[in-house]
């Protein structure tokens, strides 16, 4: 093992590096010291470090660690934030169209019951805005308060339409008889069924892209430990106290600093392959009953079928609701004639089929495919962050952490830092309070992810789940379907070009606390470009 | 060290089909995409599909739908590329390149694999 | 699909000079582009990727930028070793598309 160089005689080479980290040259000395106060860039001989240095070294070595981070995680953090707001906005304008069909589909066929269907119909929409995000509602009391809305109208203008004003008190004994009588048969449970499931799958796949977010986001402003900083500074940046400007740490030895300073987040890397496969789990279950789309926007035809099942029951209906609601009734209910095929104007309704195009269902599955090329990045952080630091190559005269080496060896350097600080307790310390909180939520969203994917009948590949990962892993840069009548009513395809009206490509600056991160400049971003060139190991 | 293997150069009759294989080593080779992109002489790069080895599941450009199928073999980690139905302008240089962890990007590359399609 | 569009085609420039290559997508990719070096008898190379991050054990002398729909690839100061083809491939919508290619030959 060859001697190390004595060092600068007078510390100019140390000087001038520094100065270039902490403007001013008071904390360095001029020539070496003994060095006696240092605590971590502990000297074998005379140093040209003193305990402020050091204490320089160890705040910038972390912000470097940071900054690495955070590039490691910017475009997979881009591509969960910009699918989040794609998604939610997607899922908005879903809505929307499915309003506008059933207003439609009130307006074509029952013009006498508009302004009021319309407005029971906008706040039945306007709760399901509001579920999908998120809020405290009851999807069966939504479809029963529209069906409880829409019968007093419908017996009022459809089925008895001469009653005098002096009648239209007996709105709450209608609204009664409405769920006591079935009076729209199976159709409203048949609604609750197929908005319930479709909007609990909706939410719970909004909700797991947006913890997707707080996972990167909680991991992309990690502060790391103090033990972490003084493994990082002995690693980077103590070679300098003796003089060793040029001089890389050994590849081995950044693998272990990095896999000691990222124990806790590499813990996430299980929960994180789990939340991707169930994530694509339930995204593989999305459909018919289970997509929004499909069921919202056929939901127009459902509630047509279930006024046609009142309106063949009409005679038997008026006469029992006659007498239930007999204080009230005024005259006897007098038919008027419906025809029997109520078409749905087709203009209105029609929705283009277009070959290829991107549906919600595809652009779901292209997020998947493209969520598992990420699917190994926590076990990957600790290669890519001494990948993009320098190493030595092969080990050839390389630093330790005390001192220029031919060969990095564990057990030796392990043996040299019997007074330092120990790698292995590093490990053992157990991950951050942030970390094991951004683990249990993880835990809880695959639960509920997983509770979600059973009905389907699909199991998680447990090949995939379970198998080991090779060392070079971490080193590169790296049911029921929905009803209807279908006589000659018109399917509505879940062909929307929903993509197209939405800015599919949200523009950096459009994405949600995202201003800055997909493209850093060299000269605002942080730390690690603000420290400039000549001193930074991580250039 | 990550290394991506590919077999050797071919020699097809038109509309012969021709398969060729990408050996995988340094990495969890289940975990990573199988991206195949071909390189006409003189001619720029284009994706043919990738490959997810976990689960088999794949994505084809337009273009070779229905021609290209893509697979994989977990137990050696290998990745396979088959084109059916060869035609004259189909001989190019295959390669095989890794997406993954960090990157969609194409981390590592094939040394390729030329393929000539020649009556 | 997108198309991305290379400029110049072919840049001569000497060691030491300053290389600007550009690549234009045909619509918003939302900086997920990345550029390859190729050199005959070796195996392409990932430089950058998500527009601006260098790959590993590529020199400080790379690097990207996005304006829009424009992207540039800078090589600062000119090597005799970068010498070679340049590609930008953007991988936001399927399917992935190169761009046709620059060649920086030495003048």
């Known amino acids: 093992q060859p001697p190390p160089p004595p060092p600068d005689a007078t510390c100019h080479q140390v000087r001038s590096f520094f100065q270039r980290l902490q403007p001013g040259l008071k904390w360095v000395p001029e020539t070496p010291v003994p060095g006696s106060d240092l605590q971590v860039c502990l000297p074998k001989g005379p140093t040209c470090c003193s305990r402020k240095m050091e204490e320089k070294y160890q705040l910038t070595a972390r912000l470097n660690m940071e900054q690495l981070l955070q590039s490691a995680s910017m475009e997979l953090k881009f591509l969960i934030i910009q699918n989040a707001a794609v998604f939610q906005e997607a899922f908005e304008i879903v809505v929307r169209h499915a309003k506008n069909y059933t207003n439609a589909m009130f307006k074509n066929n029952y013009p006498s019951l508009t302004p009021q269907a319309f407005e029971f119909v906008g706040e039945f929409f306007t709760d399901v805005s509001l579920y999908i995000l998120g809020s405290d509602i009851n999807v069966d009391d939504m479809v029963n308060e529209l069906f409880d809305s829409l019968f007093p109208v419908i017996y009022t203008q459809l089925m008895n339409p001469g009653l005098p004003d002096s009648a239209l008190d007996i709105n709450e004994c209608l609204r009664g008889a409405r769920r006591d009588l079935k009076v729209f048969g199976n159709f409203p449970k048949l609604i609750m069924t197929q908005v319930s499931k479709s909007l609990q799958v909706t939410r719970i796949f909004l909700q797991a892209l947006n913890l997707g977010i707080e996972v990167i986001n909680t991991t992309d402003h990690l502060k790391f430990s103090k033990d972490c900083g003084r493994m990082l500074t002995r690693m980077w940046y103590c070679s300098y106290c003796q003089g060793l400007m040029m001089v890389k740490p050994c590849g081995g030895y950044c693998n272990v600093v990095m896999q000691g300073c990222m124990a806790g987040v590499v813990e996430i890397d299980k929960y994180w392959r789990e939340y991707i496969l169930s994530l694509e789990e339930l995204v593989n279950g999305m459909y018919r009953i289970y997509d929004m789309e499909n069921v919202l926007l056929g939901l127009f035809s459902t509630i047509h079928d279930s006024i046609q099942y009142v309106q063949k029951n009409a005679g038997k209906l008026t006469t029992t609701i006659g007498k239930l609601c007999a204080h009230s009734q005024q005259r006897q209910y007098r038919s008027a004639y419906y025809p029997e095929d109520l078409f749905i104007d087709k203009k209105v309704l029609k929705v283009a089929h277009v070959e290829h195009e991107e549906t919600l269902s595809s652009r779901r599955r292209e997020l998947i495919q493209k969520l598992k090329s990420f699917i190994s990045f926590y076990s990957a952080l600790p290669g890519y962050i001494c990948s993009h630091s320098p190493v030595a190559e092969n080990d050839t005269l390389c630093w330790n952490g005390q001192e220029l080496v031919e060969r990095y060896s564990q057990k030796a350097a392990r043996n040299g830092m019997k007074n330092q600080f120990n790698l292995h307790e590093l490990k053992m310390k157990g991950p951050e309070p942030v970390v094991s909180q951004i683990i249990d939520k993880l835990k809880h969203i695959n639960q509920l992810l997983r509770t979600m994917s059973m009905p389907k009948g699909r199991v998680l590949d447990k090949n995939l789940d379970e198998e080991g990962f090779e060392s070079g892993d971490c080193g590169d840069d790296e049911d029921e379907c929905i009803g209807g009548s279908g006589d000659g009513m018109i399917k509505v395809k879940n062909q929307l070009r929903f993509l197209a009206e939405l800015a599919y490509d949200l523009d950096v600056d459009d994405a949600p606390g995202n201003s800055q991160q997909a493209t850093p400049k060299d000269n605002e971003i942080s730390t690690f470009h603000n420290l400039g060139n000549v001193h930074s190991p991580l250039k | 060290q990550v290394q991506l293997v590919q077999s050797g150069a071919e020699v097809k009759k038109p509309g012969a089909s021709v398969k060729v294989s990408c050996k995988a080593s340094g990495y969890a080779f289940s975990n990573s995409w199988m991206n195949w992109v071909r390189q006409a002489p003189g001619q720029g790069l284009e994706w043919i599909g990738w490959?997810?080895?976990?689960?088999?599941?794949?994505n084809y450009a337009q273009k070779f739908q229905g021609r290209a199928t893509l697979t994989a073999d977990k137990s050696i980690s290998t990745a396979y590329m088959e084109l059916s139905r060869l035609r004259s302008d189909d001989t190019a240089v295959y390669f095989c390149a890794r997406s993954g962890p960090i990157t969609m990007g194409f981390t590592y590359w094939g040394q390729g694999t030329l393929v000539t399609v020649s009556s | 699909e997108i198309v991305m569009t290379q400029s110049p085609a072919t840049l001569s420039l000497s060691p030491g000079e300053r290389a600007t290559l550009s690549c234009r997508a045909s619509?918003?990719?939302?900086?997920?582009l990345s550029w390859y070096q190729q050199k005959p008898g070796q195996a392409v190379r990932l430089l950058i990727y998500y527009t601006s991050n260098r790959a590993t054990g590529i020199p400080a002398r790379f690097s990207g930028s996005e304006s829009g729909t424009d992207y540039t690839l800078t090589i600062s100061s000119l090597e005799p070793e970068d010498f070679a083809v340049y590609y930008c491939q953007q991988y936001s919508k399927f399917p992935w598309t190169f761009g046709q290619g620059t060649k920086l030959e030495i003048k």
């Open positions: 490959i997810y080895p976990g689960d088999g599941d794949t």
């Open positions: 619509q918003g990719i939302s900086n997920y």
